[in-house]
Every structure is written in structure tokens, then in C-alpha cells.
């Protein structure tokens, strides 16, 4: 049976799943779909890591934590009652049927207060890693707006900037994501 | 083999600041989320806040945030709990724990902290 | 934030016996519930990760289960070095709580 997790239209929605790798850096591929865990792989997969990076992922899906430290929870941005459904969290571990797979539930509730366009509510309580300069996911800003045709290297320089800034330590405080990607 | 050897007893005066440490051995600090854990004489386990050696980004319990601050080394593989504004609330045994990576598989042997005029 | 429950607060049984205690998380973590043992004067130890799995080095006579909100350790054969007070702690979200521990004494 699913676990149950609940978000409200306009949040972020944030399904845990971890796995321990069996040695650092000794990192396994995890997938992420929507629909229940099938036999094999993930169906409708949405985010997908290998054993160095994240290297699939689609619009507003994202992990917020370290995946190299096996957290491997995905958030979904801004979600819609049309994301509701069960969504698959599968480690996949070398050997025959070794893969550890989760069902969660998402369940989204109508907004209680429409949410402003450019504001963000405090969820670093609810999210393990509101904050990453790691390239995780798409670039995305929440609170300075979105970050218009910026090349790699721009974004390279400003998630060094990022980093060690007291901006970085504000917008972390507050709840804001900046995600570099 | 895996060990946190954490620094030696503290006794301080109210209003004073400490900086506890946890070296780590047999294991690089920077792939392991590092935390710190409170308990007071008698009482329970209280985490208090950890950090990611990697990039330095911290966690902390809302009633901890401005009391501690937990920093990392990744040269000498230590990390570390600084504490400010003393009181005897801040009495207690400090732990450092490894987490792999929600739950903690290795802990410090602890390190007493005594808040004393 | 998550709040662990965890009963009984202490608890007295005979050595042989079968003891269980429970936890109960105020939201759902899935499995991400580990316990923890300490003796008197002694650090934390792991005992279980991911509510059931036992920890290298743990004696097979622990136990844990359980799922969502409502998760069990139980300890077969209840032996003198069992003495301890046991924590239940949930990983899933920041910050991380523990349960308010169980003190476990022999009759």
C-alpha cells in the first residue's frame, strides 16, 4: 500500500525516499515515475539519476537534497490538483529483483489563499534543502524571478557567488529556493 | 575503523561562548551529513542542528538557530558546535553523529558541558 | 515539525520476557524511523534504520516494524545487557525529532 503526503495547490510538494549507499560515492540509479512502481523500472519517469548525476529530469520535478548522500526525495514546484496520484520512488540496485521500490500517494488539496505570484511561504521545516547550489535540477528562482537566457558559465559563476554570500544565507533563512542547474 | 573523537569537558561561565570538535577517522567528513545532539542530565536526545561538509549548508531546530552554529573542516576532517550566550540550560552532553544518510550509524563518545558561575 | 510519541515511558519486565515499545509519529514517515539503544553512561547506539532493518552487529532478538505513523521495537528474550533507555528518532524531515525515550528496567 501508498504512504500518504499532502500539498496544497501553488506549494511545493516533497516525497521523501532515501537509500544508504554501500560505500561513498558507490551510488546507485534511482528512478522517479508517476503511477505505482511497475515490475522494472519506473513508468511516466519524471526524474532519473545515474551513478554520478542526475541526468533526466522534467519540468518542476527536482531533488533538494544531496542524491551523492542517497536522498534522493524529489519536489515537485507548483503543483496542480492534476499532479495528485501515486508517484514511484525506485532504487535500483545491482542484482535481480534488488530493487527497493516505494509507492507514495500525493494528494493535493485546493489553495487556501490564492497564492502570490512571486512569494514563496516558509517551507524549510516541510523540505530537507530549500537552498541548493548543486546542479540538481533546472535553473529556477523563486523569490528574484525567473533567470532569463543565462549560460552555463553565468550560472557557474553565480552559484559560486551564491554559495558563500550572505544573500545565499537570507534566502536560505526565509525559505526561498534558489536552485542552480 | 570508523570513529568521532570529540574534545574534552567544558566548564564555562554564564554569558561565555565554546567551541566543541569532532574529529572524524576512517571516513571522509565531506560524505556524510555531520549533526549535533543535546541531552541534558536525565533527559532525552535533542537534535540540535547538522551540516554538509561538501558545501558547508546547515540545518538547525528553529530554538537553536543564533545559540549554535556548526561548522566544518574538511581538512582535518573535523566538525564542530559553537555555542553562545551560555546559561545552565546549556548544561548537558554534546554528541556528534554521522548520518547515512537520515538515521545516525556512528556517534561521538560525547563532550560535557558545564554553564557555572 | 514531525513529534515522535513514544510509549511506554518505562517499563519493568523479567528477563526471558517479550517487550515491546512503540512510537507514533504525528505525520507520516514512511519507513524512515530508526531506534536507538543507551545504556547507563553510555552513547547512543543504532539499533534499527528504516523501521525493521537490523543494524550490523545487533542482536537478531530486536526487532522493529511498522509503517506511516505507527511503529514497534520489540525485544525477544529479554536479556540483562538489554537494560537501556531506547529513542526512536524520525529521518524524513528537518528538523529531526526523537521520541521521549523508554527506560527499560528488569523486574
Known amino acids: 500500500s501508498e504512504v500518504e503526503y499532502r500539498a496544497e495547490v501553488g506549494q511545493n510538494a516533497y516525497l521523501p525516499c532515501f537509500y544508504t549507499p554501500a560505500a561513498p560515492g558507490n551510488l546507485v540509479p534511482v528512478c522517479w515515475g508517476k503511477g505505482a512502481c511497475p515490475v522494472f523500472e519506473c513508468g511516466n519517469v519524471v526524474l532519473r539519476t545515474d551513478e554520478r548525476d542526475v541526468n533526466y529530469w522534467t519540468s518542476r520535478y527536482w531533488l533538494n537534497g544531496d542524491f551523492r548522500k542517497g536522498d534522493v526525495s524529489l519536489t515537485i514546484e507548483n503543483v496542480t490538483l492534476a499532479d495528485s496520484g501515486i508517484y514511484c520512488c525506485r532504487i535500483q540496485i545491482p542484482g535481480i529483483m534488488n530493487d527497493e521500490k516505494f509507492n507514495l500517494k500525493l494528494v493535493i488539496k485546493p489553495a487556501k489563499v490564492t497564492p502570490a505570484p512571486t512569494r514563496q511561504r516558509d517551507f524549510t521545516a516541510a523540505f530537507p534543502r530549500m537552498l541548493t547550489t548543486r546542479g540538481h535540477g533546472p535553473a529556477e528562482t523563486q523569490t528574484l524571478g525567473s533567470l532569463p537566457d543565462i549560460n552555463l558559465t553565468q550560472i557557474s559563476t553565480l552559484a559560486n557567488e551564491l554559495r558563500d554570500s550572505r544573500l545565499a544565507n537570507d534566502l536560505r533563512d526565509s525559505g526561498a529556493t534558489i536552485r542552480i542547474g | 575503523e570508523v570513529q568521532l573523537q570529540q574534545s574534552g569537558a567544558e566548564l564555562v561561565k554564564p554569558g561565555a561562548s565554546v567551541k566543541l570538535s569532532c574529529t572524524a577517522s576512517?571516513?571522509?567528513?565531506?560524505?556524510?551529513?555531520m549533526h549535533w545532539v543535546k541531552q541534558r542530565t536525565e533527559q532525552g536526545l535533542e537534535w540540535i542542528g547538522r551540516i554538509d561538509p561538501e558545501d558547508g549548508e546547515t540545518k538547525y531546530v528553529p530554538k537553536f538557530q543564533g545559540k549554535a552554529t556548526i561548522t566544518a573542516d574538511t581538512s582535518s576532517n573535523t566538525a564542530f558546535l559553537h555555542l553562545t550566550s551560555l546559561t545552565s540550560e546549556d548544561t548537558a552532553v554534546y554528541y556528534c553523529?554521522?548520518?547515512?544518510?537520515?538515521?545516525?550509524?556512528?556517534w561521538g563518545q560525547g563532550t560535557t558541558l558545564t554553564v557555572s558561575s | 515539525d514531525i513529534q515522535m510519541n513514544q510509549s511506554p515511558s518505562s517499563l519493568s519486565a523479567s528477563l526471558g520476557d517479550t517487550v515491546t515499545i512503540t512510537c507514533h509519529a504525528s505525520?507520516?514517515?514512511?519507513?524512515?524511523l530508526s531506534w536507538y539503544q543507551q545504556k547507563p553512561g553510555n552513547i547512543p547506539k543504532l539499533l534499527i534504520y528504516?523501521?525493521?532493518n537490523l543494524h550490523t552487529g545487533v542482536p537478531s532478538r530486536f526487532s522493529g516494524s511498522g509503517s506511516g505513523t505507527g511503529f514497534t521495537l520489540t525485544i525477544s528474550s529479554l536479556q540483562p545487557e538489554d537494560i537501556a533507555t531506547y529513542y526512536c528518532q524520525q529521518g524524513q524531515n528537518y528538523p529531526y525529532t526523537f521520541g521521549g525515550g523508554t527506560k527499560l528496567e528488569i523486574k
Open positions: 553523529a554521522r548520518s547515512n544518510p537520515y538515521y545516525f550509524d556512528y
Open positions: 576512517g571516513f571522509n567528513i565531506k560524505d556524510y551529513y
Open positions: 528504516k523501521a525493521s
Open positions: 505525520q507520516t514517515i514512511n519507513v524512515w
